[in-house]
């Protein structure tokens, strides 16, 4: 806290300008009017204030707006945003995408800070859903943003927003998140033709069910091994050897290198060795010829 002292004669600030860098902390407190500061916030970033001086300026704004800053001030905070705590930001009501962009720009190139996370949370909650423009903006600044959301939060993403998602935005998503995003992507891209559809849906396939993989296998998509390895194990297991061969096309040869890893390993264990041999890849571990396969889950359903 800066002690309250009278402003020395002739030092009252008429505008926010560079002369203020020579003011001591107590002089800034005494001589800079908070309302003047609020209306000229855009100038603060152009002036090389020290950290200690910035603390005083923030303190003045906090006193002027104890319930939280208005958006007109927030939009021009610039680097002063880095001095805000998550508690400060929770008091804000940020509705303009331009304001959000201006503040994200300040933090550009850095990890998502608690301040930024709180800001985004406030913004998205204020909007009620993650619309396309917001998602576009957020993933541009933070490619991993989408995968930082819980499945519950992802459920508020409208299918139309999926068009803004790039493959790298999904790199760190886990299966639970892809389970939520895949149906939205399927809906978003439903009117596209086969090859174009596959290009768009490919990044989301970690959430695809068996029936959709079976359908894709009929479309000559030539799925690469990297995508196949990200598929849900429970979705891959029911696929036949013929279906996997069609799904992977020329990439089927890659199964040999992945035979010890999931989901390939588990899938091999479910296939007849005879069928695996037809691939000519030397895959081992299938069900020996003459063995009867009982599907216990089916038996339970019947009883």
């Amino acid at each position: 806290e800066v002690e309250k002292t009278a402003c020395p004669s002739g030092k009252k600030a008429r505008e926010i300008d560079e002369s203020l860098i020579f003011y001591k902390k107590w002089e800034l407190e005494a001589c800079v009017d908070a309302a003047l500061l609020a209306t000229q916030m855009d100038r603060v970033n152009a002036i090389p204030f020290t950290y200690e001086q910035l603390d005083v300026l923030k303190h003045k704004l906090d006193e002027l707006y104890p319930q939280g800053y208005p958006e007109s001030v927030i939009q021009h905070l610039g680097y002063l945003f880095l001095k805000m705590s998550p508690e400060d930001i929770r008091k804000w009501n940020v509705t303009s995408l331009e304001t959000l962009k201006a503040l994200l720009e300040v933090n550009k190139g850095h990890e998502m800070s608690p301040q930024v996370a709180t800001l985004i949370d406030r913004f998205v909650k204020g909007r009620g859903q993650l619309d396309k423009d917001t998602l576009d903006t957020l993933t541009a600044f933070y490619p991993g943003y989408l995968c930082s959301l819980s499945p519950e939060e992802l459920s508020s993403v409208p299918p139309s927003s999926i068009w803004a998602v790039r493959p790298q935005d999904l790199d760190t998503c886990d299966p639970r998140q892809l389970d939520v995003l895949y149906p939205k992507a399927r809906l978003a891209f439903q009117n596209m033709n086969g090859s174009e559809y596959f290009v768009k849906i490919q990044s989301f396939l970690g959430g695809a069910p068996t029936e959709d993989l079976k359908a894709l296998s009929q479309q000559n998509v030539s799925m690469d091994l990297a995508t196949f390895m990200k598929l849900r194990t429970d979705a891959v297991l029911p696929l036949t050897v013929a279906e996997v061969q069609k799904l992977l096309g020329p990439h089927v040869e890659g199964l040999k290198a992945e035979e010890r890893h999931r989901p390939v390993r588990d899938w091999i264990l479910r296939q007849r060795q005879d069928d695996l041999d037809t691939l000519g890849l030397g895959l081992q571990g299938g069900i020996p010829n003459g063995y009867l396969v009982l599907d216990l889950s089916m038996q339970e359903a019947l009883s």
Partner: nanobody
Framework: EVQLVESGGGLVQPGGSLRLSCAAS????????MGWFRQAPGKGRELVAA????????YYPDSVEGRFTISRDNAKRMVYLQMNSLRAEDTAVYYC?????????????????????WGQGTQVTVSS
Amino acid sequence: EVQLVESGGGLVQPGGSLRLSCAASGITFSNYVMGWFRQAPGKGRELVAAITASGGNTYYPDSVEGRFTISRDNAKRMVYLQMNSLRAEDTAVYYCAAKRAYWGSDGDYQGYYYYDYWGQGTQVTVSS
């Protein structure tokens, strides 16, 4: 290598004038606040004048206000201190100093310990 070289000091009578100069090299001069400090025997170092990187704003403590004028020429990488109406108490070694001016820097622009680079100093003696 950063160098600040002061010149222009000397012996002057009370009421007289002197003009100190400081030539800077090895720094991006236009990014620095420049200051003149002085240190009298047995006393601490005090700021007598400072000027913003652009040259648009200046600072003087009450003790020299109206008598001293700081200026700079960014093209020539020079900073000057015009001292008029000199008094015996202005006798000291005068130092040129530079502090990098950037948003969110440490400390303040008045404390000598926050300045990054220093000259060797030039002696100013005011005596009859």
